[in-house]
């Protein structure tokens, strides 16, 4: 069976300040078991934007119902975008582990740019 792929179809998205940004991500498989996380940036300093497993992310909503059986859509929407939100966002699949989940595969990233709010 083919190994899971993380698909971020848009290389870039441009949003006006104050609006919401939709960042799309899809998986090609339900296996392996483990959560999805979204990060801004990569490397040691990457910023956690959304964790399917736990946490409070008031500006983030999921586009589809993640708990729905056989769901493969892990797109998110971030509200009230500001220039500080600009950057490259990665959708990352983790494999369930003990004691910690392990990064399994990442999408190629979607660069979010922020336009000035229309006057």
């Amino acid at each position: 069976e083919d190994e899971l792929q993380v698909i971020q179809p848009e290389k870039s998205v441009s949003v006006a300040a104050g609006e919401s940004a939709t960042l799309r991500c899809a998986m090609t498989s339900l296996i392996p078991v483990g959560p999805i996380m979204w990060f801004r940036g990569a490397g040691a300093g990457r910023e956690l934007i959304y964790n399917q497993k736990e946490g409070h992310f008031p500006r983030v909503t999921t586009v589809s119902e993640l708990t729905k059986r056989n769901n493969l859509d892990f797109s998110i929407s971030i509200s009230n975008i500001t220039p500080a939100d600009a950057g490259t966002y990665y959708c990352v699949k983790f494999r369930k582990g003990s004691p910690d989940d392990v990064e399994f595969k990442s999408g190629a990233g979607t660069e979010l740019s922020v336009r000035a709010k229309p006057s």
């Epitope: 990060f39 801004r40 940036g41 990569a42 490397g43 040691a44 300093g45 990457r46 910023e47 956690l48 500001t82 220039p83 500080a84 939100d85 600009a86 950057g87 490259t88 990665y90 990442s106 999408g107 190629a108 990233g109």
Partner: antibody, heavy 118, light 113 residues
């Protein structure tokens, strides 16, 4: 341009808590991560931890039990507390800015020497 | 933790000559999703904070002279000063920011021969 300035006592007694503040001037604290790094006299660099303006933190496991980093976005400041200090914590302490979009710590404060001694 | 090993500990180079510093990481710092190596190089002069020279292993920071260049991928990296100037006398550090904890090499002291 953006500048970082560390402040705090230069002398701390053993077993007490070291407290330093880094003030970010000329720019916003948003969008970057803000690190503390230390350098014992004549030695190399050791990363202590970082914080985002959201308050999310990441600490060096070797110091995690003694370290707290906090942020005050209204004052454009972030702070370091290191508890139960010993002479081994004597070092120049630097604050620095990191960019998760590129990598590397691209802006550093001048550093402040903290001596642990009774 | 990722261990960063620099060599040599020190080197003396004549003015105008090439200086080469090596850095080896105990595991790869290449992120396959964006094909970037999370490896940076810093210059530190006495009494001053470190200054970022290179990030992503080979991208020069703004304002850094082009005699400084970085190369390598995965676990093996090199900082080259193509023509050493008197103001380049300093200690140079490599650093990985691929995984936390962020870690630095032990430093290489560059002097004039």
């Amino acid at each position: 341009q953006v500048q970082l300035q560390e402040s705090g006592p230069g002398l701390v007694k053993p077993s007490e808590t070291l407290s330093l503040t880094c003030t970010v001037s000329g720019g916003s604290i948003s969008s970057y991560y803000w690190s503390w790094i230390r350098q014992p006299p004549g030695k190399g660099l050791e990363w202590i931890g970082y914080i985002y303006s959201s308050g999310s933190t990441n600490y060096n496991p070797s110091l995690k039990s003694r370290v707290t980093i906090s942020v005050d976005t209204s004052k454009n400041q972030f702070s370091l507390k290191l508890s139960s200090v010993t002479a081994a914590d004597t070092a120049v302490y630097y604050c620095a800015r990191g960019d998760s979009s590129s990598g590397g710590l691209d802006l550093w404060g001048r550093g402040t020497l903290v001596t642990v001694s009774s | 933790d990722i261990v960063m090993t620099q060599s040599p500990d020190s080197l003396a180079v004549s003015l105008g000559e090439r200086a080469t510093i090596n850095c080896k990481s105990s595991q790869s710092v290449l992120y396959s999703s964006n094909n970037k190596n999370y490896l940076a190089w810093y210059q530190q002069k006495p009494g001053q904070p470190p200054k970022l020279l290179i990030y992503w292993a080979s991208t020069r920071e703004s304002g850094v002279p082009d005699r400084f260049s970085g190369s390598g991928s995965g676990t093996d990296f090199t900082l080259t000063i193509s023509s050493l100037q008197a103001e380049d006398v300093a200690v140079y550090y490599c650093q990985q920011d691929f995984l936390t904890p962020i870690t630095f090499g032990g430093g290489t002291k560059v002097e004039i021969k």
